[in-house]
Interface confidence: low
């Protein structure tokens, strides 16, 4: 329950819920553990204005803010080389593929009228191919590529008009794809959408410094998610029988002084201000965390009692993202002067305590390598082994209900403000080549082995 996560940082064995610490655990994951891998449409599809696709805020942002990037026209060209992506998925042997739909590829100006036929065909073909391979699709409706027209006409997520427009788009996706999709994600990491899109200006649409806008955007994202959940729950779940959530991302943090209660309070405040901002309304009591309401009363919108009731419980599982985008650069306000840490196990324990031990899908996890690293990505293997070991310990030692893991990412691609200077794929792509071959990196071989053995064998 709210505030209980503080116990994670207590070094007193009577308080800490992290039962047993060991460097490594040789064990298997639960029998039907859900192994997968993910991509984001804008990062890998390319073809940013091909076949009737409309521009997104990121296409615009790239041309106006990232001067050294020609466009996402290159990228990994997944729109063109769908078969190559499918072969890569076959190679690894995943149970699911998490990908996002490009909203402006379906509806060029964002408004749901007649869908762009070529866009519809692309996603339909992809879904059919996954079903044929017995690979479960996990589909994200919004991974940051808002149709530019909606930004220009309404001011994007600052305007609550977008909520209904997003719901219309979601309805269309449920109608067209819901027969093949059992797992839906509404929005990927809304914290970054709000904070970097409207606070630091590092993400599209690149607006800076308006704290009221940051929290208005967050508010509208939560309300949009909730509306879509209720829509799915009422109109689609009865016959499609799927699940729907929102991917929430966070860092982890450790106190400067491990025995210092005020530093521990700051760590709690840090987690609450990032993860709790979105998790509390959706997975908690339907409202913003108490501390945020008090400290941000002048800029944080208010949920009415009816809205709190509407927000509460609008996720069928806890989709959690833990990767570099929440760490670099971390909002200094969120750090509270404490030390960031890559301890995924403790972050999962925090979620367990704060939100009453939910079922958790790790919806994004992984690290990055320098763009010059090709297929010998030893650092990525080290990081993956470390993260997976922490997940396994969370499951086996802490009884946390993690049911699936999404390695990020399938392919090298466009990495937001880092553009093409880093790589996150398990498959190497030479962006300058015509054929964009997917070459398995060492990490792809490693992940393949983990999946085959369902964990770590001695």
């Amino acid at each position: 329950f709210s505030g209980d996560g503080r116990a994670i940082w207590s070094k007193n064995p009577n308080f800490t819920p992290v039962n047993e610490s060991q460097l490594f655990l040789y064990d298997t994951f639960p029998k039907n553990f859900f192994w997968g891998i993910g991509t984001g449409a804008l990062q890998v599809e390319g073809s940013w204005k091909k076949d009737g696709k409309g521009p997104s805020i990121w296409d615009h942002f790239i041309h106006t803010h990232l001067k050294n990037v020609s466009s996402t026209n290159g990228s990994s060209d997944s729109y063109i080389f769908l078969e190559k992506d499918l072969s890569a998925l076959d190679f690894i042997g995943v149970s699911f593929y998490q990908f996002s739909i490009s909203w402006p590829r379906l509806f060029p100006d964002g408004i749901v009228t007649v869908a762009n036929a070529k866009g519809l065909q692309y996603y339909s073909t992809l879904l059919d191919a996954l079903v044929l391979r017995n690979i479960e699709p996990i589909v994200t409706l919004y991974h940051w590529d808002l149709p530019l027209a909606l930004q220009e006409k309404y001011g994007g997520w600052k305007n609550d008009t977008i909520i209904d427009i997003f719901n219309d788009y979601a309805t269309y996706c449920f109608q067209m794809f819901g027969d093949r999709v059992k797992y839906w994600i509404t929005i990927h990491n809304p914290y970054l959408v709000a904070w970097h899109g409207y606070g630091t200006g590092m993400h599209a649409p690149g607006e800076k410094g308006n704290l009221a806008a940051v929290y208005t955007v967050g508010h509208n994202l939560i309300k949009a998610h909730s509306k879509v959940w209720h829509n799915y729950n009422t109109h689609f779940r009865p016959h499609q029988k799927g699940w729907l959530s929102i991917t929430l991302g966070s860092h982890w943090i450790e106190p400067n002084r491990s025995e210092n209660t005020m530093d521990i309070f700051k760590c709690q405040q840090s987690m609450v201000s990032v993860l709790g901002w979105f998790a509390n309304p959706i997975h908690g009591d339907g409202d913003y965390p108490e501390g945020m309401r008090k400290k941000l009363f002048s800029v944080l919108p208010i949920f009415s009692e009816a809205e709190k009731h509407e927000m509460r419980g609008t996720a069928d599982f806890f989709a959690f993202s833990f990767g570099p985008n929440n760490f670099k650069p971390l909002n200094t306000m969120a750090k509270m002067g404490q030390n960031v840490s890559l301890n995924l196990r403790e972050a999962l324990n925090w979620i367990k305590l704060e939100y009453n031990n939910p079922r958790i899908l790790i919806a994004e996890n992984g690290w990055f390598t320098d763009s010059r690293v090709k297929t010998e990505d030893t650092t990525a293997i080290y990081m993956m082994k470390n993260f997976l070991s922490q997940v396994l310990q969370a499951i086996r030692l802490d009884e946390i209900r993690v049911f699936g893991y999404t390695a990020w990412s399938l392919l090298d691609g466009f990495e937001w403000q880092d553009a093409y200077t880093i790589r996150r794929g398990l498959f190497y792509v030479d962006f300058n080549s015509k054929q964009k071959e997917r070459k398995p990196k060492s990490s792809a071989h490693y992940y393949k082995q983990i999946i085959r053995e369902n964990g770590f064998s001695l």
């Epitope: 207590s10 070094k11 308080f15 405040q269 965390p289 501390g291």
Partner: antibody
């Protein structure tokens, strides 16, 4: 009903050591959301915070008095003890203990229950 | 260390509104608590976390906090409100409790 009661000597001599005890009831000192502070108030003057003990046994002391203070607790007896060495007439004051409660996870909601105070005079 | 500044005294006629301020560097980012102390008695918490009231405290007592000033507002002041009022914060940097110097409220 939550209560705190201070006890200790009414009179101490300069250079002596003062030991004050705060006995609590209605809540447990092991509760992860509870802490206890000692505060004093010289006659006609403002409140001055002295020390705090957190539920996990962490302690915090006033910078100006840090070298003279020791706070501790005995959970089984529901007592918090403050020891103040090298007493001086300027330490003459009413000494209070007060409870702080954590809610919302990461800050204290003020001192919601106070003892009635014990008056200590330092004189030879 | 963190310093909280209060006016030594505030006077107000019965039925009027009293405002007692507490100044501190960027105090708006801290949680401020207010105590009432009547002569010969222990302090009583009247407002916590800037603006919340403990049970039993009349609605006439309210608080606000932004920028460099926190304010305790007592509306429709009564003779029984005459007391010393102290603001308090936890200074997270030093891990210390800090009290203001106190304000004597006189009801004319």
């Amino acid at each position: 009903q939550v209560t705190l009661k201070e006890s200790g000597p009414v009179l101490v001599k300069p250079t002596e050591t003062l030991t004050l005890t705060c006995t609590v009831s209605g809540f447990s000192l092991s509760n992860a959301r509870m802490g206890v502070s000692w505060i004093r108030q010289p006659p006609g003057k403002a409140l001055e915070w002295l020390a705090h003990i957190f539920s996990n046994d962490e302690k915090s002391y006033s910078t100006s008095l840090k070298n003279r203070l020791t706070i501790s607790k005995d959970t089984s007896k529901s007592q918090v003890v403050l020891i103040m060495t090298n007493m001086d007439p300027v330490d003459t004051a009413t000494y209070y203990c007060a409870r702080s409660v954590v809610t919302g996870g990461y800050y204290y909601d003020g001192m919601d229950v106070w003892g009635q105070g014990t008056t200590v005079t330092v004189s030879s | 260390s963190y310093v909280l500044t209060q006016p030594p005294s505030v006077s107000v006629a019965p039925g009027q509104t009293a405002r007692i301020t507490c100044g501190g560097n960027n105090i708006g980012s801290e949680s401020v608590h207010w105590y009432q102390q009547k002569p010969g008695q222990a302090p009583v918490l009247v407002v916590y976390d800037d603006s919340d009231r403990p049970s039993g405290i009349p609605e006439r007592f309210s608080g606000s906090n932004s920028g460099n000033t926190a304010t305790l507002t007592i509306s429709r002041v009564e003779a029984g409100d005459e007391a010393d009022y102290y603001c308090q914060v936890w200074d997270g940097n030093s891990d210390h409790v800090v009290f203001g110097g106190g304000t004597k409220l006189t009801v004319l």
